[in-house]
Each structure stands twice: as structure tokens, then as C-alpha cells.
Amino acid sequence: MSANATLKPLCPILEQMSRLQSHSNTSIRYIDHAAVLLHGLASLLGLVENGVILFVVGCRMRQTVVTTWVLHLALSDLLASASLPFFTYFLAVGHSWELGTTFCKLHSSIFFLNMFASGFLLSAISLDRCLQVVRPVWAQNHRTVAAAHKVCLVLWALAVLNTVPYFVFRDTISRLDGRIMCYYNVLLLNPGPDRDATCNSRQVALAVSKFLLAFLVPLAIIASSHAAVSLRLQHRGRRRPGRFVRLVAAVVAAFALCWGPYHVFSLLEARAHANPGLRPLVWRGLPFVTSLAFFNSVANPVLYVLTCPDMLRKLRRSLRTVLESVLVDDSELGGAGSSRRRRTSSTARSASPLALCSRPEEPRGPARLLGWLLGSCAASPQTGPLNRALSSTSS
């Protein structure tokens, strides 16, 4: 190499990461085996769970605004779960990314896409719930499945837009021990006249922007929406929260618990550029909190089912029945403050023909078994428990 051959410029924290060498320590190998096993199991669970949720909610249930939100959340989680097997492979081959730079960029982008999409969708769900209670007339006139899908498309577009920097600055970096890292390289594009300044500003910008946009702002929206709803419902003398409220509360709690530590370590990592003493803590902690964030996608489908009241009794029924009872929309139940009668205009709007899959006339072969497990697929949308609940009071 000539004296002037500039090596791939790396930020100090990244270059120091590239110098970390693997240990042949036995206890560490056991931890690695356990991690591979855990991530492999999470991959499988996540794919199956989210696949089932998508299938049941999208194909086997009458489409409502609530099912639309859940559908898009499950789609985001399915994407994240689909990328988990590759992360598991990365762990299995000794923490080395052997799948190339392009796939490194794509894989990482899915993680961030899920992060932004989850935050945005949970914000939308909370705002939707708020509008239902605070502006019931407006909600009754504008709250349609088609509108919910449009909102989701906008949120997906925003999530994609926010993911672009993570796609651009993701890179494969060879470690000195031969392993390959798939990590941020903020000097990859237009490093500017001063690498130290670029490293610092870009690392801070990425960490702070994702903390604000994908975590703090969504949680602020969720909290303020919840406060507004609670205040309004207090005036109406309603005591017990609805089933969907409990579902949202559980999903939001899981989101905060799974993503919170990741953002803390991400901010610490940005701070570690100027404070190298933080680097070992970040290196040790970041893999754990990243896995925890991934596991959010595995936890959500479980929460959709578990937040249903009388869980054990309803688990004996078909999965469709359980999900339908959980995903009952307050507006479709005649929520507090609105009339208890069946609101045909509202339900007609909610049950717009935006179902993702067509309903087969008669299931045959394996489909018959699936139909039995997931509920009768030939059942008329008007006769399901979700519709029977329309005339009942909200629990």
C-alpha cells in the first residue's frame, strides 16, 4: 500500500469496534449458542404469529378501522420477523456479516423501518381513539377503513423516508480479526472536510432524530391522547376501559419497554464519540437492547390475543373469535357518549370492501382444517361475533 493510499475512512468509535477481537472463551461460546437458539426461536415465532395475525385479521375478519391498524402493525412486525433469521445467521457464524453490503443495508433498513412504522402506527391508533371520543361526530363521518388505509400508507411513506439515512450510511466493515461488521459508517457518503466533526454531528443527528421521531414523539402523542380520552370519559362516568383500550395499552407498554433501552444505548453511543469511556458499555449493551427491540415484533401478536378478557375461555374458541372480540372498535360497540343503538351508517363505512384477501366459498382439504382452527371462513360477515357485538354495550 502506498503512503498516500487513504484507507476507508472510519469514525473513531467504528475503527475501535473493528479492532475488537473475538474470544475463544468457553462461557462466551455457550452464551453465543444460547443467543443463536433464542433468536432462532424468536424468528420462527415471529414469522408464524404475525403471519397468522395477518391472515386472520386480513382474510378472515370483517375489515374495520381497528383491524386496519392491527393489520399494518402486524405487517411491520412480520417484516422485522422476516429479517430475524438473517440476524440469527450472523450470530451463528460468530458475529460476522457474510451476506454482503447490499443485504446488510436492506436488513438494517427493515429494522429501522419497523421502528419508525411501529411508532407512527401506535401514534395513529392513539389519535384515532382520541378523535372517536373527543370528536365523535367528525369521527363518525370521516373514520372509514379506506381513510385508515390511506393514513397507514402515508405513515409507511414517512417511515421509509426516515429509514433512507440508515440505508445510505449502513456498510460492511472488515474487522482486524477477519470478521465483518454490518454497522453505521457515517463517513460513507460525502465525509466533508473534517471527519471528526462529520462523525460527531451525523452520529448525534441520527441518534437524536430516531429517539425523537420513533420514540419520544409517538409516546408523547400516545400519552396526550390517553389523557384527553380519560378526561372526556371521566365526565361521561365511564369506569372500565374497553377491550381495544387494553390492547393498545399493552402494545404501547411493550413498545416502550422494548424500544426504550435501545434508544438509551443509541444516545450513549452518539455521546461515546466525544467520551470514549462510554464505548465499552455501548459495545456490551447494544447487542442486547437491539435484540430486545427485535423481540417486540414477536411480543405484539401474543398481546393481541392475551389482552382479550376471559382469555382461557376464549382461547378454547377459534383464533378468529378471540381476535374479533379483542379488536372490537369502541365506535362499533356504541362507545360511551354515543347512542347505544346499532349505527348502520358507521358500520357500513367501517366494513368497506378493503379486505386484503377474498373469502373462499367452501374450504377443501387442508383449508378445511385451517377453517376449523381459524373459524368458519364461509361465515357471513353479518353473523360473526364482531357484528353481534355491535348491538351490545362496550365492556
Epitope: A3, N4, T6, L7, P9, L10, C11, P12, E15, Q16, R19, L20, Q21, L176, G192, P193, D194, R195, D196, A197, N200, P276, G277, R279, P280
Partner: antibody, heavy 118, light 107 residues
Framework: EVQLVESGGGLVQPGGSLRLSCAAS????????MSWVRQAPGKGLEWVAY????????DYPGTVEGRFTISRDNSKNTLYLQMNSLRAEDTAVYYC???????????WGQGTLVTVSS | DIQMTQSPSSLSASVGDRVTITCRAS??????LAWYQQKPGKAPKLLIY???QLADGVPSRFSGSGSGTDYTLTISSLQPEDFATYYC?????????FGQGTKVEIK
Amino acid sequence: EVQLVESGGGLVQPGGSLRLSCAASGFTFSSYSMSWVRQAPGKGLEWVAYISNGGSTTDYPGTVEGRFTISRDNSKNTLYLQMNSLRAEDTAVYYCARHRTNWDFDYWGQGTLVTVSS
Amino acid sequence: DIQMTQSPSSLSASVGDRVTITCRASENIYWNLAWYQQKPGKAPKLLIYAATQLADGVPSRFSGSGSGTDYTLTISSLQPEDFATYYCQHFWITPWTFGQGTKVEIK
């Protein structure tokens, strides 16, 4: 061929000031971080100042902080070390060194002797 | 500040000998260590960076190893031109400090 040539050394009284220069050639100066390292007669090496490739970041050990200032002029391919409030213990050969990446001094100048004595 | 302790401070060896110089840091430096060779009246020369990596143009008889706080420079077969003073330096947290040096002399 990479070349680093220091100049500006000499005899100075305690409390006095001196400005060292390091002329760089044979490489793209603005792409590399630089440092000054000194060696007292018959003693070991001591790092005294660091500057990033664009000059936005500087760093010093406690022994010289507040007294020494590192700077660079990328248009002139020159590195500087402004030394104020000099003490007898600052007597040393001062080397300018190029950082291989973020660290590791891969090229050194031949040094310039600074003597602080009354 | 991180202290770098080099040992031995000096050693006598013959051409062809295997020479080992150790460097101990006062805390974990995560492989952020370089080894330099300095001959009298000359500037230091980089031999090893990142604890184990051979710098460009350095003969393969030089090698670096270690992790955590303990690092080693090994010269597998000492050559006449290798008689010099060797320094280790960490690049973990500033101030970047050097070891006090090991002088390798002809026996």
C-alpha cells in the same frame, strides 16, 4: 514519498513562547489527522497535541493544556504548534506525526529541538 | 490517565534470538495499542498497530499479540538492524501514553 519537516525550534527562556511548524508533502495533507510528540533528552516519548484532518477537533494532555495550541493550514500543507509559558521540562525534541487512520503514527518527521533555559 | 508499563527496560540478545517485550496497561485498552522502533538520533517507526497488525513494510519476524491489559511484541529471529529501543503506546482514551521503552542491545 511522505515527508514531514519540522522547523522553529531553538533556545527560549522560561515563560517565553515559540511556534513550531511542520511542512508536509507526498500525501493529501487535508485527509489526515496529525499530532505532535516530544522526547526529552535521554527519555521516552510523550504525546503533546492532536488535531483532526479539518482542524475542528484538538486534544492535549494535562501537562500542556492551556499553554500549547495545535493548528493547521491545509492550503499550505502545514501543521503548527504554538507554545506559550514554556518551562524547563518542555525541553525536548518535538516531532510531528501523521495518523495512519484515527490513531497510530505511521510517519514521523525528524524532529526539532526546543531548549527552555535561562 | 492510563499508565503503560513496559518490561524489561533493557535486554541483551544475540542475532537469531527470539525476543519478547511486554507492555501492561493500567486498564483495558481493547487492542488499541501500537509498537514503535526507534534508533538513536532517528524518529520512531511504526511496527505494529491495533495490537496485532503488522504495519506496511515491516518484516514478518515482528509480531504483536495480547488483549485486555497485557500485550506482547515478539521478534522471532533478531537481526542486526533490530537493535534499537522499542516503545508501546495506547490509543484508547486521551492522553495517549507511551511505555517507558525497552532497549534491545547486542549481547
